[in-house]
């Protein structure tokens, strides 16, 4: 903490000008005004303090708003953002879209700090709901985003917000999380044509159950062996050779490459060779022609 | 609270299936965030874990039991159930259902009391 | 699989004494998300298995702070400050990044 000293005469900061770069510390801690520094945080931005006037320019705000700054401050801190802690932004009201975008943008090219982290977990929890805007805004900024939710915050995601997410935004989640935006996704799109219908679900499909798979088969969505090898390889399994058939349609092909990988090579284990054999593709490891499968209660649910 | 309570026959023949059924009651099982596990205690040793599934029907299963296994959810009567065939001597085991999810993967917070299967002729 | 391997098998204890048990991984925990999601479990005689502790330090309500967990990557412990009566049981940790989620093989505490 700076020594309380007195202001040398005529140094009294009357504003936030790039006078205030000659300032030791001290003198800054003397001769600024935290009130004054407050209304013009704005130009605080434009001029090259150090680290360690930064500091002080800090410790003044803490001292003015010991209860947390408000969001006319907030809004303009710039890269003071950076000298805040995690306990700091926990004290912040954040309501604005436009003070949200403001902060990130400071940290933006960089992985998400502990700071951002509980900034954005303060703003979210203050709307109640991470709306379309807000998810926007954030996978703008961390296309990871998404996928560094906890299952219940995602559960909290309103099916209107899933029209604002790229398939790029999905591309670290684990299967538990898009077992919880899938649903999500179906009901935001049910109201589309076949066709557009599978384009905007294709990247939520990792957590799509056997049901809806055998449903997709039916509608002649043609889907391509990438989006197929992302599937549920327990959704896969039950799927007749037909089903895969009519799923992939002329990427049926595509199989072959695929034959040593997972979903593939425990799909074609699971099915009849001579089911295999009519695809024409020259899959082999199916079930030998000719075998009886013993446990019938087993097919039966399967198919 | 939620709570959860497995039911489903002791004793199962060798080769057969083996069904159990996990009750929710105090909560959804539609809510949100949440995944539905089974996992096993063969007797005297330690815990394996089975398979989990949402309540959309997504599931995931060990590897050791794919194929054998298949998890099933019924959201109005707000229960999840597991069935096991070609069963043997080696799925003599308590089987516990239990609630995962929420605030993180992991969080195991909520168990059924267990049903003790027997697989013998 | 990823493989989780506890020590000691047993760990005999006297009432008030503290009691660590530890648990390493075949390999390392951390999640795509940053996050470790290493469990704790308790299991006291004839009863299913309870949760104590979640990504490797938070403690679920309800549970004694006399019970915490510490670790990182694939080292893990789970420390009891002082032993109590009903602190006897089974503990196991559980790894729930990678499927399947796997349990270590358990460490039995029991009183001296």
């Known amino acids: 903490e700076v020594e309380k000293t007195a202001c040398p005469s005529g140094k009294k900061a009357r504003e936030i000008d790039e006078s205030l770069i000659f300032y030791k510390k001290w003198e800054l801690e003397a001769c600024v005004d935290a009130a004054l520094l407050a209304t013009q945080m704005d130009r605080v931005n434009a001029i090259p303090f150090t680290y360690e006037q930064l500091d002080v320019l800090k410790h003044k705000l803490d001292e003015l708003y010991p209860q947390g700054y408000p969001e006319s401050v907030i809004q303009h801190l710039g890269y003071l953002f950076l000298k805040m802690s995690p306990e700091d932004i926990r004290k912040w009201n954040v309501t604005s879209l436009e003070t949200l975008k403001a902060l990130l943008e400071v940290n933006k090219g960089h992985e998400m700090s502990p700071q951002v982290a509980t900034l954005i977990d303060r703003f979210v929890k203050g709307r109640g709901q991470l709306d379309k805007d807000t998810l926007d805004t954030l996978t703008a900024f961390y296309p990871g985003y998404l996928c560094s939710l906890s299952p219940e915050e995602l559960s909290s995601v309103p099916p209107s917000s899933i029209w604002a997410v790229r398939p790029q935004d999905l591309d670290t989640c684990d299967p538990r999380q898009l077992d919880v935006l899938y649903p999500k996704a179906r009901l935001a799109f049910q109201n589309m044509n076949g066709s557009e219908y599978f384009v905007k679900i294709q990247s939520f499909l990792g957590g799509a159950p056997t049901e809806d798979l055998k449903a997709l088969s039916q509608q002649n969505v043609s889907m391509d062996l990438a989006t197929f090898m992302k599937l549920r390889t327990d959704a896969v399994l039950p799927l007749t050779v037909a089903e895969v058939q009519k799923l992939l349609g002329p990427h049926v092909e595509g199989l072959k490459a695929e034959e040593r990988h997972r979903p593939v090579r425990d799909w074609i284990l699971r099915q009849r060779q001579d089911d295999l054999d009519t695809l024409g593709l020259g899959l082999q490891g199916g079930i030998p022609n000719g075998y009886l499968v013993l446990d019938l209660s087993m097919q039966e649910a399967l198919s | 609270q939620v709570q959860l309570q497995e039911s489903g026959p002791g004793l199962v023949k060798p080769s057969q299936t083996l069904s159990l059924t996990c009750t929710v009651s105090?909560?959804?099982?539609?809510?949100?965030?949440?995944?539905w596990n089974w996992i096993r205690q063969h007797p005297g040793k330690g815990l394996e874990w089975i398979g989990y599934?949402?309540?959309?029907?997504?599931?995931y299963y060990n590897p050791s039991l794919r194929g054998r296994l298949i998890i099933s959810v019924d959201t109005s009567k707000n229960q999840f159930s597991l069935r096991l065939s070609s069963v043997t001597a080696a799925d003599t085991a308590v089987y516990y259902c239990?609630?995962?999810?929420?605030?993180?993967?992991?969080?195991?917070?909520?168990w059924g009391q267990g049903t003790t299967v027997t697989v013998s002729a | 699989d990823i493989v989780m391997t506890q020590t000691p098998l047993s760990s005999p204890v006297t009432l008030g004494q503290p009691a660590s048990i530890s648990c390493r991984s075949s390999?390392?925990?951390?999640?795509?998300?940053?996050?470790?999601?290493l469990s704790w479990l308790q299991q006291r005689p004839g009863q299913p298995p309870r949760l104590l502790i979640y990504?490797?330090?938070n403690r679920f309500s309800g549970v004694p702070d006399r019970f915490s967990g510490s670790g990182a990557g694939t080292d893990f412990t789970l420390k009891i400050s002082r032993v109590e009566a009903e602190d006897v049981g089974v503990y196991y940790c559980?790894?729930?990044?990678?499927?399947?989620?796997?349990f270590g093989g358990g460490t039995k505490v029991e009183i001296k």
């Open positions: 239990a609630r995962d999810g929420g605030d993180s993967y992991g969080r195991m917070d909520v």
């Open positions: 105090g909560g959804s099982i539609s809510s949100g965030g949440y995944y």
């Open positions: 599934i949402y309540y959309s029907g997504s599931t």
């Open positions: 390999q390392s925990l951390v999640h795509s998300d940053r996050n470790t999601y």
């Open positions: 990504k490797i330090s």
């Open positions: 559980m790894q729930a990044t990678q499927f399947p989620l796997t």
